[in-house]
């Protein structure tokens, strides 16, 4: 009989699809901090503003004290722009002075952090010269790609310099992740 | 860009309510706070109190009671009302955006842009 | 409500000068602390939040210090337009109150 070609054991069971709506996913903007102490060989991490502008957290996605809580296991798509600036006076004392406190480069990592794995993990780094360009400079640098992540995970932003992140305008400097 | 435009200035007698508008640009109502300040003669700033991007208000207790702050989506516009008015209400009311701000892991708030104030007088 | 007492009531100063106003909290505030410049018949200008970064586009001979329940800001050469009432607001907790303010006069 026809209908025995798809007998119970050989049925193939779908799950049904999923609106995008419901995924967890989060866009950040940039939010005024102070620069704070941090570790010699350690970049600081940017807090980010949540809930005001264009920030928001959705479907269990969290923000809690500059990171970005993974609510379940999956393949997720996570980006982060940051915008630096700063002026080329800098970058000529860099060189007449061999000033350490002021940068010939910004970094900026996307950094993962597992509660079960002792060490941070980098998943994304891009590095900019800034002592090339113009008088008032601007630089900003943008990550993007996929990673599987685990539920607990947590993201941050780390850069080189707080102090030469752009905080101006929110569409300059953001940090999001969406599940796929 | 981010501006905050008052209404314009009035009198009132003393017992009457005053209504103030601030019509803002540059950002929407529903994605940030906006907050009131007032500022007698010769006088410091006084917080009055603000309403929330999600539509909730808080007020400082010395108006409670008295003090209604009100939104219009659709004009982008927050209203602040000051009823049973006396002469010491007499002052210069404005509107101001709030900004969050971090300093190690705790955030605070402050106001970088600002209405041009609207002036309330409450005379007999 | 935290309380925010500044100091001086009035100060005046030449140009040139270096001037020092300080803010006291009745608790302490965690550095949640924001200068606000005022001239007549204006709105307040924020310059300093944090009780120490630099607002954008605000000169740098204005500087802001301090921690816990005492804080200062520091004009290190006064201009013409720096002549102007400031004031100090904390930030942490609603009603965040605003100092009384500090008007700095030609001397």
């Known amino acids: 009989l026809k209908g025995q070609e798809f007998a119970p054991s050989h049925q193939q069971v779908y799950a049904p699809l999923r609106a995008d709506g419901d995924k967890p996913r989060a866009h950040l903007t940039v939010v005024r901090q102070t620069p704070t102490q941090h570790f010699k060989n350690q970049f600081p991490a940017l807090h980010w503003e949540h809930e005001l502008g264009l920030a928001f957290t959705k479907n269990r996605m969290n923000y809690t004290n500059k990171f970005l809580l993974i609510p379940e296991s999956g393949d997720y798509f996570i980006y982060s722009q940051v915008t630096f600036r700063g002026m080329t006076s800098e970058c000529s004392e860099i060189r007449q002075a061999g000033r350490p406190n002021k940068p010939d480069s910004i970094t900026v990592v996307i950094t993962k952090v597992t509660d079960s794995y002792p060490e941070p993990t980098q998943l994304l780094m891009g590095t900019k010269s800034v002592c090339e360009v113009g008088s008032n400079w601007f630089q900003p640098i943008y990550l993007g790609a996929m990673f599987s992540l685990q539920e607990g995970d947590k993201l941050m932003v780390n850069v080189s310099d707080i102090s030469l992140v752009d905080y101006t305008k929110e569409d300059k400097t953001f940090f999001g992740a969406f599940l796929l | 860009q981010v501006q905050l435009v008052q209404s314009g200035a009035e009198v009132k007698k003393p017992g009457a309510s005053v209504k103030v508008s601030c019509k803002v640009s540059?950002?929407?109502?529903?994605?940030?706070?906006v907050h009131w300040v007032r500022q007698a003669p010769g006088q410091g700033l006084e917080w009055m109190g603000v309403?929330?991007?999600?539509?909730?208000?808080d007020y400082n207790s010395k108006f409670q009671g008295r003090v209604t702050m009100t939104r219009d989506t659709s004009t982008n516009t927050v209203y602040m009302e000051l009823s049973s008015l006396r002469s010491e209400d007499t002052a210069v009311y404005y509107c101001?955006?709030?900004?969050?701000?971090?300093?190690?892991?705790?955030?605070?708030?402050?106001?970088?842009?600002w209405g041009q104030g609207t002036l309330v007088t409450v005379s007999s | 409500d935290i309380q925010m007492t500044q100091s001086p009531s009035s100060v005046s100063a030449s140009v040139g000068d270096r001037v020092t106003i300080t803010c006291r909290a009745s608790?302490?505030?965690?550095?949640?602390l924001a200068w606000y410049q005022q001239k007549p018949g204006k709105s307040p200008k924020l310059l300093i939040y944090?009780?120490?970064s630099l607002q954008d586009g605000v000169p740098s001979r204005f500087s802001g210090s301090g921690s816990g329940t005492d804080y200062t800001l520091t004009i290190s050469s006064l201009q013409p337009e720096d002549f102007a009432t400031y004031f100090c607001?904390?930030?942490?907790?609603?009603?965040?109150?605003f100092g009384q303010g500090t008007k700095l006069e030609i001397k």
């Open positions: 101001a955006r709030a900004g969050r701000y971090y300093v190690d892991s705790n955030y605070y708030w402050d106001f970088p842009y």
């Open positions: 540059g950002f929407s109502v529903t994605s940030y706070n």
């Open positions: 309403m929330w991007y999600g539509g909730n208000t």
């Open positions: 608790e302490d505030i965690y550095s949640g």
């Open positions: 944090g009780a120490s």
């Open positions: 607001q904390e930030g942490l907790k609603s009603p965040y109150t």
